[in-house]
Interface confidence: low
């Protein structure tokens, strides 16, 4: 069964900056990745970035840089300052659309007691929805 993992960490060098990393553990080819915060995409969450293998990457504030890390994982850096900046308990969600598995989404947030620059290893987060 495919799984999605989500890792959130606060950067030690810029304490109000977050890095979100997400990956897809499946055999299908990924056609789209959507990163949102405040809840799952389409369920009250706000889209931060959309990564398409062929059409490129689109991102919206406070997303600072989205990129493909590997063929099945992405990372996103969030701007740390301003009214729309994330707080420690913000939920981030990643949705992977793949063929033939369909859409798989998981969410994660900063570990409650994490020190800046530290985070748990990227383990599969609970799968919220498989379309």
């Amino acid at each position: 069964t495919p799984e999605v993992w989500v890792q959130v960490r606060m950067e030690a060098t810029e304490l109000s900056s977050f890095t979100i990393r997400c990956g897809f553990l499946g055999s299908g080819s990924i056609s789209l990745v959507t990163v949102s915060w405040g809840g799952p995409n389409g369920a009250g969450g706000t889209t931060l970035a959309v990564l398409h293998p062929e059409r490129g990457i689109r991102q919206w504030a406070p997303a600072r840089q989205a990129r493909w890390e590997t063929q099945s994982s992405i990372s996103l850096i969030l701007e740390g300052s301003g009214a729309s900046s994330p707080c420690a308990n913000t939920t981030f969600c990643c949705k992977f659309a793949s063929f033939p598995e369909g859409s798989w989404e998981a969410c994660g947030s900063l570990p409650p007691s994490s020190d800046p620059g530290l985070s748990a290893p990227p383990t599969p987060a609970p799968i919220l929805r498989a379309d």
Epitope: E11, T13, E14, S17, T19, S29, P53, E54, G56, I57, R64, Q65, R67, W68, E69, T70, Q71, S73, I77
Partner: antibody, heavy 120, light 107 residues
Framework: EVQLQQSGPELVKPGASVKISCKAS????????INWVKQSHGKSLEWIGY????????GYNQKFKSKATLSADNPSSTAYMELRSLTSEDSAVYYC?????????????WGQGTPVTVSS | DIQMTQSPASLSVSVGETVTIICRVS??????LAWYQQKQGKSPQLLVY???NLAEGVPSRFSGSGSGTQYSLKINSLQSEDFGSYYC?????????FGGGTKLEIK
């Protein structure tokens, strides 16, 4: 005008370390990745890694993970690459290059290159 | 890692001719590919990004095409300033890798 100015040629002894600099001008330094690329004499190009100056985040080619350390000093808009435990295999020209996020990560501006010669 | 195989390795051509350089990739990179030109003793220069888009200031005699695992760079009506080496590079996840290069020489 965007420019990447690299430090001058280096002649170093085997086993030593060297730190190459790449000073950026003409754009907001923290907005773009700086990549480092190796070119041995008469050979192709090898990607070493990138640094994202805004948070100091970096990504490496595993082949160079134990050889190179990338860093950046934002106030001076300068990226650095330190190469350690040098051998003759490390003799090459090293380039820094800006990664253009609007051009699907292609490297749109390059430094002039820093030749490194490892010799006893 | 993704492997990039460029062909031919070298090419001897005359001014005014048309040349095509091929870059074969070990897996689908979804057009996440760039082409660079490098002249002797100089830094590489970006020619094409996203497989088909010409970089700023690049003459229209250059064109990029391809998708999936095969890409090509075409140079129409070759000029004397076009001689040098050409490299493809993918950006579909790290490590970004370059092709082995194609050396374009004057016949």
């Amino acid at each position: 005008e965007v420019q990447l100015q690299q430090s001058g040629p280096e002649l170093v002894k085997p086993g030593a370390s060297v730190k190459i600099s790449c000073k950026a001008s003409g754009y907001t330094f923290t907005d773009y990745n700086i990549n480092w690329v190796k070119q041995s004499h008469g050979k192709s190009l090898e990607w070493i890694g990138y640094i994202y100056p805004y948070i100091g985040g970096s990504g490496y080619n595993q082949k160079f993970k134990s050889k190179a350390t990338l860093s950046a000093d934002n106030p001076s808009s300068t990226a650095y690459m330190e190469l350690r435990s040098l051998t003759s295999e490390d003799s090459a020209v090293y380039y820094c290059a800006r990664e253009d996020k609007t051009a699907r990560n292609a490297m749109d501006y390059w430094g002039q290159g820093t030749p490194v010669t490892v010799s006893s | 890692d993704i492997q990039m195989t460029q062909s031919p390795a070298s090419l001897s051509v005359s001014v005014g001719e048309t040349v095509t350089i091929i870059c074969r990739v070990s897996e689908n990179i979804y057009s996440n590919l760039a082409w660079y030109q490098q002249k002797q003793g100089k830094s590489p220069q970006l020619l094409v990004y996203e497989a088909t888009n010409l970089a700023e200031g690049v003459p229209s005699r250059f064109s990029g095409s391809g998708s999936g695992t095969q890409y090509s760079l075409k140079i129409n009506s070759l000029q004397s300033e076009d001689f040098g080496s050409y490299y493809c590079q993918h950006f579909w996840g790290t490590p970004y890798t370059f092709g082995g290069g194609t050396k374009l020489e004057i016949k």
